[in-house]
């Protein structure tokens, strides 16, 4: 539908078009499988318009249906390290808080490959914090064209 002139003059955030694209900052300390993200113009092609970062985890500020996407490339990678581990390397994206809404949204395994990528549409609510867990000991690349994570508000 076409926007009225008044709507055209509003910032995107007020129209509900929340969007974020993040790059990897660092991995967690021992016993913490989470990936920690960062975003902002000073860092390159990453940004937050609406959602915010809470200790490296992405927090949603507006209810709606979102497209969630992620790509992770391993900096330490071989066919044996990704396919024959006793504990295969997997990436999971989920709502980690609030605890009452905790759920897995995406789960991917590295099967004889060094890169995984996926996306899905899912409803998210204000206050939902998304966590990305990379199991195992393998180290992800911080190259911004290899590892990135984002959300895009699609509709209420």
């Amino acid at each position: 539908q076409r926007l009225s002139r008044a709507q055209q003059q509003l910032p995107l955030e007020s129209l509900g078009w929340d969007i974020a694209e993040l790059q990897l900052n660092h991995t967690g300390p021992q016993q913490d499988p989470r990936l920690y993200w960062q975003g902002g113009p000073a860092l390159g092609r990453s940004f937050l318009r609406g959602p915010e970062l809470d200790k490296g985890q992405l927090r949603i500020r507006r209810d709606g249906i979102y497209m969630v996407h992620i790509q992770v490339t391993l900096a330490i990678c071989s066919s044996t390290s990704t396919s024959r581990h006793h504990h295969p390397t997997t990436l999971a994206v989920g709502i980690c808080s609030p605890a009452s809404r905790s759920i897995s949204l995406l789960r991917l395994s590295f099967h004889q490959g060094c890169t995984i990528a996926s996306q899905r549409l899912t409803p998210l609510a204000r206050g939902d914090t998304l966590c990305t867990n990379l199991t195992g000991t393998l180290l992800p690349s911080r190259n911004t064209d290899e590892t990135f994570f984002g959300v895009q508000w699609v509709r209420p």
Partner: antibody, heavy 120, light 108 residues
């Protein structure tokens, strides 16, 4: 200026243990993955082990797995390599090396190395 | 693991000449993730090239890298006296990262 200074090498008997240290300065140590690389006298370079910037992820060459342990203390800007059950073939100069920001294991800065000799 | 074979083992040249060093991988190197290092006696290696062709900070432009897949080359144009050393290639696209055994560039 980035500086890496290894210490802790020496002569040890087969089956013995040694702990190497690498003191880092001139960069934000906790931001970067680090590795140990060794070079036996007159031989090729061999990557030994790596550790992520936070210390939560480690990886080892098959030749040392189960015998060596890599660790770091980011509050002291120091990298460690605990070497147990040492063998004659572990004799080498051991270098600590800083990864590029990307995490990939290529090394933009190296220490001067510390010599480990395993002999009876 | 990927085995890297460097040739020739020794290259005898005069200052001002061009050095061409070869590094061949036993299988394809992912995304041309290959580095070159220079090592002088009693010193640590120094990074020259990464990503097969990108020069590291502070490396003079007489050093250049090329290649992809399994065949890579380090070229040193107009050898300077300080360039006589051992050169190693290293792949870091597949674990474990592995090194070649070096090419020694010495003065003819």
């Amino acid at each position: 200026e980035v500086q890496l200074l290894e210490s802790g090498g020496g002569l040890v008997q087969p089956g013995g243990s040694l702990r190497l240290s690498c003191a880092a300065s001139g960069f934000t140590f906790s931001t970067y993955a680090m590795s140990w690389v060794r070079q036996a006298p007159g031989k090729c370079l061999e990557w030994v082990s790596l550790i992520s910037g936070s210390g939560g992820r480690t990886y080892y060459a098959e030749s040392v797995k189960g015998r060596f342990t890599i660790s770091r203390d980011n509050s002291k800007n120091t990298l460690y390599l605990q070497m147990n059950s040492l063998r004659a073939e572990d004799t080498a100069v051991y270098y600590c090396a800083k990864h590029d920001y990307s995490n990939y294991p290529y090394f933009d800065y190296w220490g001067q190395g510390t010599l480990v000799t395993v002999s009876s | 693991e990927i085995v890297l074979t460097q040739s020739p083992g020794t290259l005898s040249l005069s200052p001002g000449e061009r050095a061409t060093l070869s590094c061949r991988a036993s299988q394809g190197v992912r995304s041309s993730y290959l580095a070159w290092y220079q090592q002088k006696p009693g010193q640590a290696p120094r990074l020259l090239i990464y990503g097969a062709s990108s020069r590291a900070t502070g490396i003079p432009d007489r050093f250049s890298g090329s290649g992809s897949g399994t065949d890579f080359t380090l070229t040193i144009n107009r050898l300077e006296p300080e360039d006589f050393a051992v050169y190693y290639c290293q792949q870091y696209g597949s674990s474990p990262p592995t090194f070649g055994c070096g090419t020694k560039v010495d003065i003819k």
